[in-house]
């Protein structure tokens, strides 16, 4: 019995179906086929879980969180024992193993390993201004998404004809911050943060209103 090499890892957007491949060759009939799919979740590496089981001509459910979402892609028994997972969740990320036994065929490699990564587009980020908006001050524009896998990068731009940040601005696309030093009236305007990763983008906006000192009435 020989389980074929798997593609190594699969990436899927949250909520989309994933197919985890596992095929094997055997010299014996599939009368005593026994297949166990296990997962070692990324979130809990020391707690492997059963995903689905085929034994004695019957299918059995694995861990409750997979109920109704998992099944074999083809009619069993077969030499293709790939499975699908519908409505993938972040918690489905992990290392999946298919363990195949088909007595009396013993020996050879009977385990296939596939990594599954569930990707999450950035959630709508929150934009915030830190610091005084009085003319001459330094301000920091903050942007962060609560969700996003892979971790989003953040790009700030000013929404006007140029889409360019003021010349006194420095940007950190990893942290999602823009520091604008010595703000002037020209710093005022709409600033958009674009949070993006491999599978999506999301935005938020800020209205920076730089306040000039008001002339005092004398008398």
């Amino acid at each position: 019995l020989e389980v074929s090499e798997s593609p190594g890892s699969i990436q899927v957007a949250r909520g989309q179906p994933a197919v985890l491949p596992c095929t094997f060759t055997t010299s014996a009939a599939l009368i005593n086929l026994n297949v166990i799919w296990m997962v070692t979740p990324l979130s809990n590496a020391n707690q492997p879980e059963q995903v689905i089981l085929y034994q004695g001509g019957q299918m059995f459910d694995g861990a409750p969180r997979f109920h109704g979402r998992v099944g074999f892609t083809g009619t069993m028994p077969a030499t293709n024992v790939s499975i699908f997972i519908n409505n993938t969740q972040l918690s489905d990320t992990g290392t999946y193993q298919c363990l195949v036994n088909n007595l009396p065929d013993i020996g050879g490699r009977n385990i296939g390993v596939t990594g599954l990564t569930v990707l999450v587009p950035p959630s709508a980020p929150h934009c915030q201004i830190q610091g005084s908006q009085d003319i001459g001050s330094d301000v920091i524009l903050l942007c962060s998404s609560e969700e996003g896998i892979p971790r989003p990068t953040y790009l700030w731009e000013k929404l006007d004809n140029t889409l360019k940040l003021p010349p006194t601005a420095t940007q950190d696309q990893v942290q999602g911050t823009v520091t604008i030093r010595n703000i002037s009236a020209l710093s005022s305007g709409l600033y958009q943060c674009v949070a993006s990763n491999a599978i999506g983008t999301s935005t938020c906006l800020l209205d920076l209103q730089v306040i000039s000192p008001q002339p005092r009435n004398i008398g």
């Epitope: 709508a124 005022s188 800020l206």
Partner: antibody, heavy 119, light 106 residues
């Protein structure tokens, strides 16, 4: 009390021009960004133009870009909207609105001025 | 651009009833703002940044939501609440408004 009063209403032919004004009082005009928002006869609300508090930054939706120009005179506490190449779909009630805080939302509205574009 | 779908289009309620109207965005947004408009008047700011009541808005109003789903709730409807309520976002450019929910009092 914040007060925004629009003027410049009129009936204009397609392709024509019109300038709207908005007189502001009851607040330090130069400290706030402003926008124009319109409401179509079907009661749909559409943002038309934005200008920063100092007037150095303006922004428009694609529907009016190149045809409308927003400006302000902070010494006169007045906001303007110059509209040209007007189309029938520009027919609407035009409101001037003041922004507040750092979230772009329309915190104060004028009573509106009606612009009708028709042959 | 983000499309805001308001439901129901028309909401009929009796005084004292609790009512909820919803605003669904075609993509996730950071905040939702709400405006009240009565016939012949300009829109009034009602709720900003999802849950903050604008000045002068009665405490029976509340706003909530996140992501793509937001709502405005009136705990006990009064006759003066009859109006059209619009949601608005400017998390994503350009800013967009919903088509409104018209609240009628029986």
């Amino acid at each position: 009390e914040v007060k925004l009063v629009e003027s410049g209403r009129g009936l204009v032919q397609p392709g024509g021009s019109l300038k709207l004004s908005c007189a502001a009082s009851g607040f330090t005009f130069s400290s706030y960004s402003m926008s124009w928002v319109r409401q179509t006869p079907e009661k749909r609300l559409e943002w038309v133009a934005y200008i920063s508090n100092g007037g150095g930054s303006t922004y428009y939706p694609d529907t009016v870009k190149g045809r409308f120009t927003i400006s302000r005179d902070n010494a006169k506490n007045t906001l303007y909207l110059q509209m040209s190449s007007l189309k029938s779909e520009d027919t609407a009630m035009y409101y001037c609105a003041r922004h507040d805080g750092n979230y772009p939302w329309f915190a104060y509205w004028g009573q509106g001025t009606l612009v009708t574009v028709s042959a | 651009q983000i499309v805001l779908s308001q439901s129901p289009a028309i909401l009929s309620a009796s005084p004292g009833e609790k009512v909820t109207m919803t605003c669904r965005a075609s993509s996730s947004v950071s905040y939702m703002h709400w405006y009240q408009q009565k016939p012949g008047s300009s829109p009034k700011p009602w709720i900003y940044a999802t849950s903050n009541l604008a000045s002068g808005v009665p405490a029976r109003f509340s706003g909530s939501g996140s992501g793509t789903s937001y709502s405005l709730t009136i705990s006990r409807v009064e006759a003066e609440d009859a109006a059209t309520y619009y949601c608005q976002q400017w998390s994503s450019d350009p800013p967009t408004f919903g088509r409104g929910t018209k609240l009628e009092i029986k």
